[in-house]
Interface confidence: medium
């Protein structure tokens, strides 16, 4: 069944931003390519394992790849699937979990000597018709491997903020975590109402920079809703 191949893309109680502005249920909203954000309060839950549609591997998390959920399935219907662990069959690098790459159709470990900070080798073998040409290592594999050599720049895939260069933090963006800039004065920040809610967001923000705190902006143009807008302000 479909559920047997789905992973943890579905998350519990998605925050209001995904369904349009909070308090405005409106119609459903779609993101191109092929991403549907349900409207109203019909958010995905961990219990029904909603598949996350995708068009390419980069739209999925670092431990996922984009493919049809069924063998030989319709290429037009693709979702993010859990990555393949070591010694599992693969057709391209992105199918293998971080720290592995696809060699001769099997996910194998990427030893430290194999990755020299940058990819020096291009593989052009072909397997079937599912993203068939292995045109070099996937961006996600490259970046997660590079992290061990240099601090990630803005947009680099990361696991934690210590993976990122100075002035950046590691925050979720869609289903990956990337290095984003620490927020400056006047930038919109997220004030979390309850402990642990930070992990639910797919457009996660960094924290405010040194000497700044995330506070309500009182003079926001939408007076009646101003309590929802927080910006980084001087202490």
């Amino acid at each position: 069944t479909l559920n047997s191949v789905l992973n943890s893309n579905a998350i519990k109680n998605l925050p209001p931003p995904l369904g349009g502005a909070a308090g405005h249920p409106g119609s459903a909203v779609s993101a191109a390519p092929g991403i549907l954000y349900p409207g109203g309060n019909k958010y995905q839950t961990i219990d029904n394992y909603q598949p996350y549609p995708c068009a390419e591997d980069e739209e999925c998390g670092t431990d996922e790849y984009c493919a049809s959920p069924t063998r030989g399935g319709d290429a037009g219907v693709q979702i993010c699937l859990a990555c393949r662990k070591r010694r599992k069959r693969c057709m391209r690098h992105a199918m293998c979990c971080p720290g592995n790459y696809c060699k001769n159709g099997i996910c194998v470990s990427s030893d430290q000597n194999h990755f020299r900070g940058e990819i020096e080798e291009t593989i052009t073998e072909s397997f079937g018709n599912d993203h068939s040409t292995l045109d070099g290592y996937s961006r996600r594999t490259t970046l997660s491997s590079k992290m061990y050599h240099t601090k990630g720049q803005e947009g680099s895939v990361c696991l934690r903020s210590s993976d990122c260069a100075s002035g950046l933090c590691c925050a979720r963006h869609f289903w990956s975590k990337i290095c984003k800039p620490v927020l400056k004065e006047g930038q919109v920040c997220t004030k979390h109402r309850r402990k642990g809610s930070h992990g639910l967001e797919i457009f996660q923000r960094c924290y405010c920079g040194e000497g700044l705190s995330c506070r309500i902006q009182k003079d926001h143009h939408q007076a009646s809703n101003s309590s929802r807008l927080h910006t980084c302000q001087r202490h």
């Epitope: 909203v29 963006h173 800039p181 919109v188 457009f203 939408q222 809703n225 910006t231």
Partner: nanobody
Framework: EVQLVESGGGSVQAGGSLRLSCTAS????????VGWFRQAPGKEREFVTA????????YYADSVKGRFTISRDNAKNTVYLQMDSLKSEDTAVYYC??????????????????WGQGTQVTVSS
């Protein structure tokens, strides 16, 4: 602070097309998510479409998907909204808005810190 100016609004017959422009001054639009919202008489302002900083990702309300197209020209500091197959229910004041950075949540109007004055679009059947 970025100032946004919308243009291109007007009256059109149902089934016709209009192209709205949103031009920024004061700060480059290239580093931020930009969206279009609309407000019909007596209704709440609603999300229409948005585009990420690079133009690689676009977002649409289901009511306009397949008819409206958002694009951006960062060199000209302008974001465009091409509206085709217009319907009477598209009649509204259309607002362009800019978020504070490139990582804003594109569907949430509270993420948008700079707003234009709006341009009227009237579709008659």
């Amino acid at each position: 602070e970025v100032q946004l100016v919308e243009s291109g609004g007007g009256s059109v017959q149902a089934g016709g097309s209009l192209r709205l422009s949103c031009t920024a001054s004061g700060r480059a639009l290239s580093s931020a998510v930009v969206g279009w919202f609309r407000q019909a008489p007596g209704k709440e302002r609603e999300f229409v479409t948005a585009i990420n900083w690079s133009g690689a990702r676009t977002y649409y309300a289901d009511s306009v998907k397949g008819r409206f197209t958002i694009s951006r020209d960062n060199a000209k500091n302008t974001v465009y909204l091409q509206m085709d197959s217009l319907k009477s229910e598209d009649t509204a004041v259309y607002y362009c808005a800019s978020a504070s950075d490139r990582y804003a949540r594109p569907l949430d109007e509270y993420e948008y810190v700079s707003w234009g004055q709006g341009t009227q679009v009237t579709v008659s059947s």
